[in-house]
Interface confidence: low
């Protein structure tokens, strides 16, 4: 676009420029080619020699312009059409400019302490004659000249007549600029163009409100000599929480969010989250929902899983092993990263479940205690004669660091009972006779421990090879027994089980089994043999 610094046609009042001498340039009212009233300056001292008539405009502020265009519209009379002017008439005039920091005033033209700079000598492409004048055919010439680069705040133009018959119809002074614009969400200020022969003017843009450029690399454009923007480089992006709408960034409405400038548009909140405010950069999870630190903001909010289902166990008593298995939680919380952790509590044999304490390092968990992906686990090194509560907690990425203590667990309570906590080699053959066998074993509960005095033992025995259904039974309250009335030189199978008196007796299993052969009649007794 053109930024007009002076347009003589726009003035309805007198221009009031300074003319010297006073019988030179004269301000006259007239009409333009469209019959609109204008103010013009004319001079036609063609019959007198040595003309030196000056016309100085008022002070013209250059604004941002450095290279200024001067457009002159004028008419010039053909000297040959003026009788008697052949020796003195001229068909050119001169144009000058003088840079100043301020208006020189309306007094004598002070075209500087040094000579004003000449812009050019202007000649008419077309001049008019006396005949044209009679037919009112005014042949209008237009000439454009460029001045600059300018360095001071403004300047005066000066026109020198040296004997022509000339009328200045219009003086227009302007510079070209690339107009203020928004491109790629960056505002570029109005920028004065350089001359057609110089390089493009590179201009850094400013990101519009709520937008941002690449750090250290603002968007740029180039202002061409003709006042057109060229070669955009880079752009801005709407900041988090804002999206592009034409030339500006608008806030994401409630229910939408934008996490970073790299995304062009706001996105609807992921499942189970919400954004109540404008310009949300993330959506807040609804109550009881959350994201893990590794979840992106675009991920749906999830929640901790419900408890594992259908927790089942099996307890083998020799060795004492507790096997657990379970099904996944009914509600995974919307996540696939469900793991399981076990908490083992050892409780008193009687009394409320609350009288428990952690099992301690003795108990081993297979494959591990925490972070299980499997839905089965085995607990080893449990104590006989104890009651255990085992919690299986379902966890996922939003369970939090201590969620296993929360409510998302299933639990079983298992009494190991005295059971038969012996290996085969822990039952000793103390004495073998032709008709009797003496056996002893370790007490399953240490002497003095609760329940130790109540333990009873049941010994079942039968001849090897006979049916297990044909057996004899003997009970004892001590961890030793002597079985009599046996057949000599006969192999017997002995089985032991331990239990406290009461209904749990039948639940215990007979194991292990050991075999002992009675001696022949001739043989003498053997004592304190090694363990079987």
């Amino acid at each position: 676009e053109e930024v007009i610094l002076l347009d003589s046609k726009a003035s309805q009042a007198e221009l009031g420029w300074t003319a010297l001498p006073s019988n030179g340039w004269e301000e006259i009212s007239g009409v333009d080619e469209h019959d609109r009233p204008i103010r013009t300056y004319q001079v036609c001292n063609v019959l007198e020699p040595n003309q030196d008539n000056w016309l100085q405009t008022g002070w013209i502020s250059r604004g941002r312009g450095q290279r200024i265009f001067v457009e002159l519209q004028f008419t010039l009379r053909d000297c040959s059409s003026i009788p008697g002017a052949a020796g003195t008439c001229k068909e050119t005039f001169n144009v000058y400019y003088l840079e100043t920091e301020a208006d020189l005033g309306r007094g004598r033209p002070r075209l500087g302490g040094s000579r004003p700079r000449k812009i050019d000598t202007i000649a008419a492409d077309e001049s008019f004659t006396q005949g044209d004048l009679g037919e009112r055919k005014m042949k209008l010439n237009t000439e454009v000249r460029e001045i600059g680069p300018l360095s001071r705040r403004g300047f005066h133009l000066a026109f020198q007549d040296v004997g022509a018959c000339v009328a200045l119809v219009s003086v227009r002074v302007y510079y070209k600029q690339c107009r203020a614009t928004v491109r790629g969400l960056a505002t570029f200020p109005a920028t004065a163009a350089e001359s057609a022969f110089s390089t493009l003017v590179e201009v850094a843009g400013t990101c519009v409100a709520h937008s941002e450029g690449e750090p250290g690399s603002p968007p740029r454009m180039h202002c061409g000599a003709d006042g057109e923007w060229l070669v955009p480089v880079g752009r801005c992006s709407c900041s988090a929480g804002f999206q592009e709408r034409g030339d500006f960034c608008e806030a994401c409405p409630p229910g939408f969010y934008k996490v970073s400038p790299r995304r062009p548009l706001c996105s609807p909140c992921p499942e189970h989250s919400r954004a109540l405010e404008n310009a949300s950069t993330f959506c807040v999870c609804q109550d009881s929902y959350a994201r893990s630190p590794t979840d992106p903001p675009s991920a749906s909010c999830t929640r901790p899983p419900s408890a594992p289902r259908d927790l089942q166990y099996s307890l083998s008593r020799s060795p004492l092993v507790l096997r657990l298995r379970w099904l996944p939680p009914a509600d995974s919380g919307g996540r696939s990263d469900v793991t399981y952790s076990l908490l083992c509590l050892r409780c008193g044999r009687e009394g409320p479940a609350g009288a428990c304490e952690p099992c301690g390092p003795r108990v081993a968990f297979l494959p591990r205690q925490a972070g299980l992906r499997e839905r089965a686990a085995t607990l080893l090194h449990l104590r006989p004669g104890a009651r255990y509560t085992v919690r299986v907690a379902a966890l996922n990425g939003v369970s939090g660091p201590a969620a296993a203590a929360g409510t998302t667990y299933a639990q079983v309570t298992v009494s190991t009972g005295p059971g038969a906590p012996w290996e085969e080699d822990e039952i000793r053959r103390d004495r073998v006779e032709p008709q009797s066998v003496s056996l002893s074993w370790r007490e399953p509960i240490p002497a003095g421990a609760p329940g130790a005095n109540d333990t009873e033992y049941e010994i079942r025995y039968y001849e090897k090879g006979q049916s297990e259904q044909t057996y004899s039974m003997v009970k004892t309250g001590a961890p030793t027994v002597t079985v009599t009335n046996l057949k000599p030189a006969t192999r017997y199978v002995f089985q032991i089980r331990a239990a406290s008196p009461g209904p749990s007796w039948e639940a215990q299993s007979f194991n292990p089994s050991i075999e002992v052969q009675t001696l022949g009649e001739a043989a003498s007794g053997s004592r304190d043999q090694s363990p079987a």
């Epitope: 908490l343 205690q369 925490a370 972070g371 939090g400 201590a402």
Partner: antibody, heavy 117, light 107 residues
């Protein structure tokens, strides 16, 4: 014996960095979440950070978020706390602690961090 | 974050007497609360977890109660070795927090 042995404390200027270590022994380290807790001189306990057993999840107290980083090397049975941009108010005894499902059942003896110019 | 407020800040009790320590949460932590004992120059020691479960090796004179927002640690008959600072701690959220502590001193 189950124990946590701490190292890495010392005196550091404000804005400086320090890395604390906590070596675990006597238990299966990679079965447990681990925490850092601190205690300013004459003050109460303040929880600092936690890391899950496999290092996949980390949580921090607001007061250290963005400055401290908790990490672990299960192959070395070691827990770490990288402390950057230290401030005077970070001066404290720092304890590592095992998350015994559910509470902190094993603690290190602590290491003193002094932030002073 | 969940704020835990312990009271009193200092409790003076004679050996053999009962001590009652209080911990109040700014919002419900269900039963996700632990109590720790700390003696000068030593790290804390777990006393109670799950609000009422005694940790391994803790004598029966220590008991915990409460759920939701109000919790109590009771020491039924104080022994000389029980005089120390006690802290409650919640683990019901990812931002774990401790109470300010109660110093239990000999009267």
């Amino acid at each position: 014996e189950v124990q946590l042995v701490q190292s890495g404390g010392g005196v550091v200027q404000p804005g400086g960095s320090l890395r604390l270590s906590c070596a675990a022994s006597g238990f299966t380290f990679d079965d447990y979440a681990m925490h850092w807790v601190r205690q300013a001189p004459g003050k109460g306990l303040e929880w600092v950070a936690v890391i899950s057993y496999d290092g996949s999840n980390k949580y921090y107290a607001d007061s250290v978020k963005g400055r401290f980083t908790i990490s672990r090397d299960n192959s070395k049975n070691t827990l770490y706390l990288q402390m950057n941009s230290l401030r005077a108010e970070d001066t404290a005894v720092y304890y590592c602690a095992r998350d015994g499902l559910p509470a902190f059942d094993i603690w290190g003896k602590g290491t003193l961090v002094t932030v002073s110019s | 974050e969940i704020v835990l407020t312990q009271s009193p800040a200092t409790l003076s009790v004679s050996p053999g007497e009962r001590a009652i320590l209080s911990c109040r949460a700014s919002q419900s932590v269900r039963s996700n609360l632990a109590w720790y004992q700390q003696k000068p120059g030593q790290p804390p020691r777990l006393v109670i977890y799950d609000a009422s479960s005694r940790a391994t090796g803790i004598p029966a004179r220590f008991s915990g109660s409460g759920s939701g927002t109000d919790f109590t640690l009771t020491i039924s008959s104080l022994e000389p070795e029980d005089f120390a600072a006690y802290y409650c701690q919640q683990y019901g959220s990812s931002q774990l927090t401790f109470g300010g502590g109660t110093k239990l001193e000999i009267k």
